[in-house]
């Protein structure tokens, strides 16, 4: 039962994580205009992986897609690639893990097959989570570098008269969503790998050995240890924890999100 719970929880955590990675990838607020220590403007700029947006104080918002592939910074392309790889791996992992779930019966699938699938999906979730965390971290590093560069250039003007106040960008909501989602996917993947260990049938069954006593034709088979060692001729290797009432559908509650703005 503990393995089923671990596997089920790993699946749910990964599912939430991958949904978060998808949400982060689609969000426009990867970087937002830094308002601290800046002249107060009636226009607010924010940027995503796919488009940049401008919100006027009147409420009018205009977004423009990046309709070029070659003109974009290599780092942005790398972040896009990492996030997409993360989503694809996560999606495949989810598909595999659905069939690997112990509570779902598919034909006469062996436990060993389910264990392999659980491990595969677990590894996929781990890589997916790492891709998301890496993508978000690369973008965050890019922001920090640009922030300090623009801060250094901010007050450079002829004779102390500032002609252009450079727009500085800071971390947007998508970065935090991405970090949390990547972490959840990673944790879910680790849980799946742990569950796999419990699912795997032990292949160390001893074969029956005949002892021939001289002058007798009686065969002795070591069966006396069966109860204490757990080994024997039962190759189905039925687990003790597999019995009893199932508690896979335990209700999970999450704290509700309150935005105070």
């Amino acid at each position: 039962m503990a393995v089923t719970a671990c596997q089920g929880l790993g699946f749910v955590v990964s599912l939430i994580g991958i949904a978060g990675i998808i949400a982060a990838t689609c969000m426009d607020q990867w970087s937002t205009q830094d308002l601290y220590n800046n002249p107060v403007t009636a226009v607010f700029n924010y940027q995503g992986l796919w488009r940049s947006c401008v919100r006027e104080s009147s409420g009018f918002t205009e977004c423009r897609g990046y309709f070029t592939l070659l003109g974009l910074p290599a780092m942005l392309q790398a972040v896009r690639a990492l996030m997409i790889v993360g989503i694809v791996l996560g999606a495949i992992g989810l598909l595999v893990s659905i069939f690997a779930l112990k509570c779902i019966r598919i034909g006469s699938m062996e436990d060993s097959a389910k264990a392999n699938m659980t491990l595969t999906s677990g590894i996929m979730f781990i890589v997916s989570g790492l891709c998301a965390i890496a993508g978000v971290s690369v973008f965050a590093n890019m922001l920090v570098t640009n922030f300090w560069m623009s801060t250094a250039n901010m007050y450079t003007g002829m004779g102390g008269m500032v002609q252009t106040v450079q727009t500085r960008y800071t971390f947007g909501a998508a970065l935090f969503v991405g970090w949390v989602a990547g972490g959840l996917t990673l944790i879910g993947g680790v849980m799946m790998c742990i569950a796999c260990r419990g699912l795997a049938p032990e292949e160390t069954n001893y074969k029956a050995v005949s002892y021939h006593a001289s002058g007798h034709s009686v065969a002795y088979k070591p069966g006396g240890f069966k109860a204490s060692t757990g080994f024997g001729s039962n190759t189905k290797n039925k687990k003790i924890y597999d019995g009893g009432a199932r508690t896979e559908d335990e209700v999970q509650s999450y704290p509700s999100k309150h935005d105070y703005v």
Epitope: S52, S57, E62, T167
Partner: antibody, heavy 119, light 113 residues
Framework: QVQLVQSGAEVKKPGSSVKVSCKAS????????IEWLRQRPGQGLEWMGE????????KYNVKFKDRVTITADESTSTAYMELSSLRSEDTAVYYC????????????WGQGTLVTVSS | DIVMTQSPSSLTVSLGEKATISCKSS????????????LTWYQQKPGQPPKRLIY???TRESGVPDRFSGSGSGTDFTLTISSLQAEDLAVYYC?????????FGQGTKVEIK
């Protein structure tokens, strides 16, 4: 059609307060900023502040912040601007205007309210 | 505060002639996010409230005759009346609507010769 109707002309003594009203009609009021500006005789325009109808968010020009109070009564679709500690240099035409949805500028204006400060 | 400087302070033009008004801001009104300059032109006729002619430096308000055009970006802007009409007699103001507090130029009075 969009209309902003302001209260009538006022004559005030120095040191007193004046409260100008601006009734909006012809559009969905919530989500629009109502601006307050003034124009002294023969002078240019000065922005005093703004209020976002529906949220109560207010921004003031720091030049007027200590003396001006902008409020709104959503039940009557009316915005108010109160200017205290009046001086003779506050004699001006006071305008309310609606901030348009594009460009952050003011697409509809009230007819103006002349406030004369005289002893 | 952003200082808006208009020139000339008054302009006398013959009917049918071109009138050009200049406006300079002390800081750039260009927003890097959408490459738009947040400058508005207003027309104020005697005894009336101002009327918006042009916003985003060059976008004409609906219903405004096409003889009015705006140009410029960053800190330097121009309002052009291609063929002056009698009804264009007014004071024209430019406004910074990028930085708070919003500020106006001192105005340019257009008169007919």
């Amino acid at each position: 059609q969009v209309q902003l109707v302001q209260s009538g002309a006022e004559v005030k003594k120095p040191g007193s307060s004046v409260k100008v009203s601006c009734k909006a009609s012809g559009y969905t009021l919530t989500g629009y900023w109502i601006e307050w500006l003034r124009q002294r005789p023969g002078q240019g325009l000065e922005w005093m502040g703004e209020i976002l109808l529906g949220s109560g968010s207010i921004k003031y020009n720091v030049k007027f912040k200590d003396r001006v109070t902008i409020t709104a009564d959503e039940s009557t679709s009316t915005a108010y601007m109160e200017l205290s500690s009046l001086r003779s240099e506050d004699t001006a035409v006071y305008y309310c205007a609606r901030k348009g949805l594009r460009g952050n500028s003011f697409d509809y204006w009230g007819q103006g309210t002349l406030v004369t400060v005289s002893s | 505060d952003i200082v808006m400087t208009q020139s000339p302070s008054s302009l006398t033009v013959s009917l049918g002639e071109k009138a050009t008004i200049s406006c300079k801001s002390s800081q750039s009104l260009l927003n890097s996010g959408n490459q738009k300059s947040y400058l508005t032109w207003y027309q104020q006729k005697p005894g009336q409230p101002p009327k918006r002619l042009i916003y985003w430096a060059s976008t004409r308000e609906s219903g405004v005759p096409d003889r009015f055009s705006g140009s410029g970006s960053g800190t330097d802007f121009t309002l052009t009346i291609s063929s002056l009409q009698a009804e264009d007699l007014a004071v024209y103001y430019c406004q910074n609507d990028y930085y708070y507090p919003f500020t106006f130029g001192q105005g340019t009075k257009v008169e007919i010769k």
